[in-house]
């Protein structure tokens, strides 16, 4: 079987998710469900996949939902907000998923993998 | 340091066609979307066209589809714009830009050529 | 098609600030980008991803970008700021580039 995917492909491959997300909006991604912002910083995916993880039968999303998972070391699941330092602030997933695409393309320039 | 540079441009009658140049320099061509984009006298920035790294996506302004074909030859590090049935709108500057990120056509254009001017006139 | 306005002038005294607009339908859900072009030179980029500065572009040049409008701040404007300022975004409902019209900054005195 092949081995582990280098973390520069990986993060390659999530930023060209996003990407399509974000390129192929035709109308309100996820019928314009709220999610909670997160701080980009240490534990970044980990607090992503558990904000979006509560967003459900959005299909947009549910390849970003299984890549993000594994960059998370642990199991995440709806209702799971230990990453999540601060709740105080809702936005659009279409916010949320340009967010984090900006910030993982800063990343990548810097050749921040993990 | 990165460097394009246009050529191909010139005065070309209602009808005619010409193929514009872009030779590339600097970075690594292939990893980079670019694109055309065009400034008629006095007037604003028009999007023309772009090309997707690998050259598998291309994309076209309504104004010349049909009419224009984007196309790049990597291994020369060079970008063409193929001009058919000109038109005197097609009258302008055109500039070739690369885009600053490997993905998709979301990004700005971080560097600029210093355009090639083509005259569309009988 | 997408739609991008821009207001066709601007004009500030030196030292105080600039702020250009660029109008359009949820452009907060967009990625901005700015672009500089003096007379009879090609276009500069100097905000990109909404509010980043390629290196090489002084901290006075900063971008904001929510609802319905982004926005190209200059602050300290010097007379060297004088040119045209595009904005810029894809639009991914029909697969295009587009420009806004463009601003003319001009520096009083």
């Known amino acids: 079987s092949p081995g582990p995917v280098p973390p520069s492909t990986a993060l390659r491959e999530l930023i060209e998710e996003l990407v399509n997300i974000t390129q192929n909006q035709k109308a309100p991604l996820c019928n314009g469900s709220m999610v909670w912002s997160i701080n980009l910083t240490a534990g970044m995916y980990c607090a992503a996949l558990e904000s979006l993880i509560n967003v459900s039968g959005c299909s947009a999303i549910e390849k970003t939902q299984r890549m993000l998972s594994g960059f998370c070391p642990h199991k995440v699941s709806a209702g799971q907000f230990s990453s999540l330092h601060v709740r105080d602030t809702k936005i659009e997933v279409a916010q949320f998923v340009k967010d984090l695409l900006l910030h993982l393309k800063k990343l990548f320039r810097e050749g921040r993998f993990n | 340091e990165v460097q394009l540079l246009e050529s191909g441009g010139g005065l070309v009658q209602p009808g005619g066609s010409l193929r514009l140049s872009c030779a590339a320099s600097g970075f690594t061509f292939s990893s980079y979307a670019m694109s055309w984009v065009r400034q008629a006298p006095g007037k604003g920035l028009e999007w023309v066209s772009a090309?997707?790294?690998?050259?598998?996506?291309?994309y076209y302004a309504d104004s010349v589809k049909g009419r224009f074909t984007i196309s790049r030859d990597n291994s020369k590090n060079t970008l063409y714009l193929q001009m058919n049935s000109l038109r005197a709108e097609d009258t302008a500057v055109y500039y070739c830009a690369k885009a600053d990120f490997w993905s998709g056509t979301l990004w700005g254009f971080d560097y600029w050529g210093q355009g090639t001017l083509v005259t569309v006139s009988s | 098609s997408y739609v991008l306005t821009q207001p066709p002038s601007v004009s500030v005294a030196p030292g105080q600030t600039a702020r250009i607009t660029c109008g359009g339908n949820n452009i907060g859900n967009k990625i901005v980008h700015w672009y500089q072009q003096k007379p009879g030179q090609a276009p500069v980029l100097v905000v990109y991803?909404?509010?980043d500065r390629p290196s090489g572009i002084p901290e006075r040049f900063s971008g904001s970008n929510s609802g319905n409008t982004a926005t190209l701040t200059i602050s300290r404007v010097e007379a060297g700021d004088e040119a045209d300022y595009y904005c810029q975004v894809w639009d991914s409902s029909s697969d295009h580039v587009v420009f806004g019209g463009g601003t003319k900054l001009t520096v009083l005195g």
């Open positions: 090309i997707s790294g690998s050259g598998g996506s291309t």
């Open positions: 991803d909404d509010s």
